[in-house]
């Protein structure tokens, strides 16, 4: 059997760090057997069998010129094996962030915080966090850990399905390369990372006979499974063409009548969604839809209470009528109140999405 431990990575390749001493191991001999070392294609002896280093070649302070293929020979001139040296760096803690577009699934993405230059893989798992009271020690419910299944197409993403909205989870993303492993832990709760997809199917139509009105309607994003306790609320913005500022209203339901449109001008309209109890954040804006108020015969405009803030159709209220939410109000986040780095010696930048 070979005296050389096989690091994770392609066979026949051994690894080291630039600027560090590197040991290469002759794979086809017995441990301790004296061998001669050559660079592939070069006749010059690098290290002879009398070096006292047995089956190993030592390169002091390796640099990029040392990368390449090496050949080791036994005392009788037989080939002991060929070894390719690749230099790079041990893993650093990856940068990890998690997102949720609905209330029962979330995904986490990662990227290296430093480029190692070596073959790299990521191990992803998660666990439900539980703080046990002394009297509940006898029965610890199943909290994992479980694997976080990675996207099959090699994207740096894994998805947790069937998460509990009120639970907190710990994600473990470990970067592994032939020189070691480094782990990033991240605690996530659906209620804090929830960001719905934008509403879909936005339509803007004129209201015949009302030159200052536009009727906008939209649907829930397809990714959001509607349930009485997990509804969305919406925010609608509109502006006339060439007008820089948006007007904002919060409609009730899935449609809104704008009552202060500028007659004769096309208007851009967009909508955003958020959990109706303010978990997480607002979605991105939907693609803009355009509409121009009617120029038909004028109806008497009835002054409405909203004073240009948009008027909801009665049908919407009926349509959205549902039982009172059986969901507790959101807990304040118990997180640090400042930005000092505590239990880690390594500092990493986090990209906010």
């Amino acid at each position: 059997s070979s005296p050389c431990p096989q690091a994770w990575g392609p066979p026949g390749v051994q690894y080291g760090q630039p600027g560090r001493s590197v040991k290469l191991c002759c794979p086809g001999v017995t441990a301790g057997d004296p061998v001669s070392w050559f660079r592939d294609g070069e006749p010059k002896l690098l290290q002879g069998p009398d070096s006292g280093l047995g089956h190993e070649l030592v390169l002091a302070q390796a640099d990029s010129t040392d990368e390449g293929t090496y050949i080791c020979q036994t005392l009788d001139g037989a080939l002991g094996g060929t070894v390719t040296l690749q230099l790079g760096y041990p893993p650093a803690r990856p940068v990890v962030s998690c997102q949720a577009a609905d209330y029962e699934n979330f995904s986490c993405t990662w990227s290296p915080s430093q480029i190692s230059g070596l073959p790299t893989r990521y191990l992803t798992s998660y666990r439900k966090k539980t703080v046990l009271g002394a009297d509940s020690q006898r029965r610890s419910p199943s909290t994992g850990p479980w694997p976080c299944p990675q996207d099959p197409l090699g994207a740096a993403r894994c998805v947790v399905h069937g998460a509990e909205f009120w639970s907190q989870y710990r994600i473990n993303v470990t970067e592994v390369n032939p020189l070691g492993a480094s782990t990033r832990l991240l605690d996530v709760s659906l209620q804090s990372i929830l960001r719905p997809d934008p509403p879909q199917g936005l339509r803007v139509e004129s209201v015949p006979g009302y030159p200052r009105r536009l009727h906008a309607s939209w649907t829930y994003p397809a990714s959001w499974r509607r349930q009485p306790h997990f509804l969305l609320k919406f925010r609608l913005q509109y502006r006339p063409a060439q007008h820089p500022a948006w007007s904002t209203v919060e409609p009730i339901g899935l449609e809104e009548v704008i009552t202060d449109a500028v007659a004769g001008l096309p208007h851009a309209v967009r909508v955003s969604a958020r959990d109706f109890l303010d978990a997480g954040t607002w979605s991105a804006w939907s693609p803009e839809a355009w509409g121009t108020p009617s120029t038909g015969p004028l109806q008497d405009e009835i002054p409405d209470w909203s004073q240009g803030h948009g008027q909801q159709l009665e049908a919407v209220v009926a349509q959205e009528d549902s039982p009172a939410p059986a969901r507790p109000s959101l807990q304040p986040d118990p997180r640090p109140l400042d930005h000092r780095d505590p239990l880690e010696q390594h500092h990493h930048h986090h990209h906010h999405h």
Epitope: G144, T183, P334, L337, R340, L343, E344, H348
Partner: antibody, heavy 126, light 112 residues
Framework: EVQLLESGGGLVQPGGSLRLSCAAS????????MGWVRQAPGKGLEWVSY????????GYADSVKGRFTISRDNSKNTLYLQMHSLRAEDTAVYYC???????????????????WGQGTMVTVSS | QSALTQPPSASGSPGQSVAISCTGT?????????VSWYQQHPGKAPKLLIY???KRPSGVPDRFSGSKAGNTASLTVSGLQAEDEADYYC???????????FGTGTKVTVLG
């Protein structure tokens, strides 16, 4: 059953060394932050040391820094406290404890010890 | 790493409420929402009562509640019972040396 069991305590002379062990069972040890807390006879609790799930980061109280080393072997589900240059004031019951911790995108924080061992007595005396 | 300051003792009759304060600095109690409270009976290991200022672990009665204002955290035990007679300690993330810090401890006596 979720359990922590300390061992290794005993009588040692000033300047001597001792190694405490804490065997964990009933939970996935490698995912948890762990710590040591001590209590001198008739006194209050004193936070001693703390270690990351992977063992990569540690923390110590000023009173033991440079003399005590915390470590863990996740393959054996065991936490250790190596104590050197022991003093009379190190005499105490030493508890091993588990912490969920809290990990943000950049940092992890000590949170609360939810599971405790029964303690092991260390006596430093000549 | 100075210990957090607690009153040495507190007392109340059965059914009454007792509040224990825990004063630190902006580097510990005031700077982080990682304040926890423990109960310890003589000769026993401590038991977690409250974590992250206000949260109760499973199995801890709702007679125990926590709060915080500025650099001072508080534990309130309402509806005192005989078995609540014990030592109580607060703890906080310490903000330095990857460290935590405990309070000086409060002995609660249930009168009568």
């Amino acid at each position: 059953e979720v359990q922590l069991l300390e061992s290794g305590g005993g009588l040692v002379q000033p300047g001597g060394s001792l190694r405490l062990s804490c065997a964990a069972s009933g939970f996935t040890f490698s995912w948890y932050f762990m710590g040591w807390v001590r209590q001198a006879p008739g006194k209050g609790l004193e936070w001693v040391s703390y270690i990351y799930p992977s063992g990569g980061s540690t923390g110590y109280a000023d009173s033991v820094k440079g003399r005590f080393t915390i470590s863990r072997d996740n393959s054996k589900n065991t936490l250790y406290l190596q104590m050197h240059s022991l003093r009379a004031e190190d005499t105490a019951v030493y508890y091993c404890a588990r912490d969920e911790g809290y990990c943000s995108s950049t940092s992890c924080y000590f949170d609360a010890f939810d599971i405790w061992g029964q303690g092991t007595m260390v006596t430093v005396s000549s | 790493q100075s210990a957090l300051t607690q009153p040495p003792s507190a007392s109340g009759s059965p059914g009454q409420s007792v509040a224990i304060s825990c004063t630190g600095t902006s580097s510990d109690v005031g700077g982080y929402n990682f304040v926890s409270w423990y109960q310890q009976h003589p000769g026993k290991a401590p038991k977690l009562l409250i974590y992250e200022v206000t949260k109760r672990p499973s199995g801890v009665p709702d007679r125990f509640s926590g709060s915080k204002a500025g650099n001072t955290a508080s534990l309130t035990v309402s509806g005192l019972q005989a078995e609540d007679e014990a030592d109580y300690y607060c703890s906080s993330y310490g903000g330095s040396n990857n460290a935590g810090v405990f309070g000086t401890g409060t002995k609660v006596t249930v009168l009568g």
